[in-house]
């Protein structure tokens, strides 16, 4: 049974509030042999990172004004650097910090 924040390589969408603390874990991808490493491409803006073992996280607070949606691709590679699975689309939607707290002009 895979947990809520871990699982196989498949297309996914995540919503993240802008301005949140960086270095937050988004998802842990699990490799199926012979896949041993993961690779992230697309609109990473050097913010999104995937570790070889499949841990996807972001290392800077997101800014919705800069980019409201990040279209990424994740692939699983074998020991020879050849793609075994993917690349699959991973969509990161950046949510407005004010979405849940509407303010009204007087």
């Amino acid at each position: 049974q895979e947990g809520k924040f871990s699982g196989p390589l498949k297309p996914m969408t995540f919503s993240i509030y802008e301005g949140q603390e960086p270095s937050q874990i988004i998802f842990q991808f699990k490799a199926n042999p012979p896949a041993v490493t993961f690779e992230l491409t697309g609109e990473t803006d050097n913010i999104f990172v995937i570790e070889r073992e499949g841990l996807l996280y972001y290392n800077r607070a997101l800014d919705r004004e800069t980019r409201s949606t990040h279209n990424l691709q994740v692939a699983a590679l074998d020991a020879n650097g050849i793609i075994v699975e993917g690349p699959v689309p991973i969509t990161i939607k950046v949510k407005d910090i004010n979405d849940n707290r509407p303010t009204f002009l007087q």
Epitope: A75, A79, N80, G81, I82, I83
Partner: antibody, heavy 120, light 107 residues
Framework: QVQLQQSGRDLVKPGASVKISCKAS????????INWVQQRPGQGLEWIGW????????YYNEKFKGKATLNVDKSSSTAYMLLSSLTSEDSAVYFC?????????????WGQGTTLTVSS | DIQMIQSPSSMFASLGDRVSLSCRAS??????LDWYQQKPGGTIKLLIY???NLNSGVPSRFSGSGSGSDYSLTISSLESEDFADYYC?????????FGAGTKLELR
Amino acid sequence: QVQLQQSGRDLVKPGASVKISCKASGYTFTDYHINWVQQRPGQGLEWIGWIFPGSGSTYYNEKFKGKATLNVDKSSSTAYMLLSSLTSEDSAVYFCARGKSGYPFYFDYWGQGTTLTVSS
Amino acid sequence: DIQMIQSPSSMFASLGDRVSLSCRASQGIRGNLDWYQQKPGGTIKLLIYSTSNLNSGVPSRFSGSGSGSDYSLTISSLESEDFADYYCLQRNAYPLTFGAGTKLELR
């Protein structure tokens, strides 16, 4: 020097099986992958799959699953490809090629090819 | 599967000519492309690996370039032993796929 010596030409009947060999010399057999490639008459090259002699692990092109079976005999540094349920479509030249393990995975040495003819 | 389209399928050239052979992938392959030469006798030899790296023992008149999905092999000055079939191979993703080949013939 590195050499891959393949078995000679084969003439077999439809429905039969055949085992093609590829004897490696001049390097440590268990450190490199052995790839197999098909070339039909007058056609291009098609990758069948690889075997890593060090562990015996294999990876097949889906198209050849059930048709080709790869194995090795480490004691004689020989790789084998068994082709089963042969039809005229399997008539081709089959090459073995050494694959450098890790990245980049290029095929730096090739066997001379084994011609297989399937005919009744 | 990634399709590899080679062009031209055949070409005629003369000794001393500079020729370029093309290989286009159906999607980006991150430079994971090799070039092989097959002589009329069937012998296959690695020329270039990873787009532009010359295999040891291969004459410097051979060179490779490209990125994304478009790649090429150039022979700067044809010699008699260069008339052969040339194949590109992508090893970016399984299954590994070859182009259909370019036959280089003496004019």
